[in-house]
């Protein structure tokens, strides 16, 4: 017997659907109507034929009451080839839902997204996460998607992007966006970061994550942030192969005084990099290749320093920095 494509947990909280059949019975997803978290994986299906069975241009207001009765707050849609027109139709209908967090992963969006009709309501998301989503429209995809969202987006995550740079002149500002995560875009690099951080489009960023993004030096990142006018409180540069030395010809970069937390763990560092901010609340240098305890003059003024998992740190070694705190837990590096 074929397993049921959708599974709802005992609390009607989480529902996961895996549609792997060539012609899936989409009505099976109806059992997810009372779930708060819904995941729908379409097994790599091309949803183009689906367009013939739905009227993507129908007025979504006719579904408003039904959609409002859905419990879903977090929706994940994955593994499909989706016509942009169908995506837009879904976003228009979901605008009447309670959906707050949307994740799109392993999708290929084909065709172009039509402009938002004057009478249409945008989707009031607080979080949008994209992983391995390709868009036929290239660099303009974010601007096209943005017009279907209300301006209150707080968290934006873009991983494994085929085009992590955006068409900045078309993108509107994200006035409420406090967290931007561009992690897992190894081809991004510092020049790509400059292109992705559209100047003055991210005025409220507090947390910026750049794990595994091909960054080379903290100074290079500093320059990209300065050029974009982005002043995060927290910056995650972990899982990049960082160079400790700065190119002597590169201009010195002044870090924003807003930055108080910097994560440089798993960065392959053999010494503390030059050009760090002068003062930090939190500095994570764990799981690097530091062969000796950093000297006070190599480090910023820092309240909470983590050095676990470095070769020099053998049990019984004195703490390397006055006022620093080491967890005592040796991480698996």
């Amino acid at each position: 017997t074929t397993p049921e494509p959708c599974e709802l947990d005992d609390e009607d909280f989480r529902c996961v659907c895996n549609f792997s059949e060539p012609q899936p019975d989409w009505s099976e997803a109806f059992q997810c109507v009372s779930a708060v978290e819904v995941e729908i994986h379409a097994g790599g299906l091309n949803l183009e034929p689906f367009l013939k069975r739905v009227d993507a241009d129908a007025d979504p207001r006719q579904y408003a009451d039904t959609v409002k009765a859905l419990r879903v707050r977090r929706l994940t849609v994955g593994a499909a080839q989706v016509p942009a027109q169908l995506l837009v139709g879904a976003l228009r209908v979901l605008a009447y839902s309670r959906l707050k967090e949307l994740t799109l992963e392993d999708l290929k969006i084909t065709g172009t997204m039509p402009p938002l009709p004057l009478e249409a309501t945008g989707l009031a998301l607080s979080s949008l996460r994209l992983r391995n989503v390709s868009w036929a429209t290239g660099r303009s995809w974010l601007a096209e998607l943005q017009q279907w969202l209300k301006p209150g987006l707080k968290v934006l995550s873009i991983a494994q992007a085929h085009s992590p740079a955006f068409s900045c002149e078309q993108v509107r500002a994200f006035p409420a966006l406090t967290s931007l995560d561009l992690s897992d875009n190894p081809g991004l690099g510092e020049r790509g970061l400059m292109a992705a951080l559209c100047p003055h489009k991210f005025p409220a960023i507090q947390n910026l994550a750049l794990r595994n993004t091909g960054m080379e030096t903290p100074t290079g990142v500093c320059a990209a942030l300065a050029a974009a006018g982005v002043q995060p409180h927290s910056l995650d540069l972990s899982h990049n192969s960082l160079r400790a030395t700065v190119n002597p010809s590169a201009p010195r970069c002044m870090w924003s005084s807003a930055l108080n937390s910097l994560n440089l763990s798993f960065a392959g560092l053999e010494q503390v990099p030059k050009g760090l901010p002068a003062k930090l609340r939190v500095l994570d240098l764990s799981c690097n290749r530091l062969n000796r305890a950093p000297q006070p003059d190599e480090l910023p003024e820092v309240d909470n320093l983590t050095l676990d998992g470095n070769p020099f740190l053998v049990p019984g070694t004195a703490l390397p920095h006055e006022g620093s705190m080491n967890s005592g837990v040796v991480p698996a590096c």
Epitope: D12, F13, A69, R73
Partner: antibody
Framework: LVKPGGSLKLSCVAS????????MSWVRQTPEKRLEWVAS???????YYPDNVKGRFTISRDNARNILYLQMSSLRSEDTAMYYC?????????WGQGTTLTVSS | QSPASLAVSLGQRATISCRAS??????????MHWYQQKAGQPPKSSIY???NLESGIPARFSGSGSRTDFTLTINPVEADDVATYFC?????????FGGGTKLGNQ
Amino acid sequence: LVKPGGSLKLSCVASGFTFSSYAMSWVRQTPEKRLEWVASISSGGTTYYPDNVKGRFTISRDNARNILYLQMSSLRSEDTAMYYCARGYYDYHYWGQGTTLTVSS
Amino acid sequence: QSPASLAVSLGQRATISCRASESVDSFGNSFMHWYQQKAGQPPKSSIYRAANLESGIPARFSGSGSRTDFTLTINPVEADDVATYFCQQSYEDPWTFGGGTKLGNQ
């Protein structure tokens, strides 16, 4: 007793059911006996908060040790209440005995 | 939630009402629940999703209603039922509770 602006972490040790399989919540009861939902966490660790505590309170869980936590910071006088941990997300099938928090200078 | 307090003779019926500002129904489920709280104790689930009796709760307790209007009925009332009863909705964020109904004996 905690001063305004202070922090506190509450713990709730669960027993008698498979802790890791259930959503858990914190609910508080004010001195006026009004009940208020404070935070919820799914079995997988997804968190939900009402706006009045979002950014100040953090719910977390340790499924290996069957412990539910509530980290509270920037405490205000209006956070004074009896805090209960409870099993469930939509509704609360089982409740702990509660712990009293007083926020006052 | 009404009334704020209620005095009922033992053996009689007690009816407590809860009205939501909008429908709390979703695809056949009504997200309204009832709790009993005795003095000095935590609340205890009595009825969940409008009409489902929590295990261990006597069949004298019943819940009814849909959309915006819900009722908790205790019939017949026994001395052990003296408590405060709260309704709670989990349809619209944030989940909210009624102000409570204090049930006493006449």
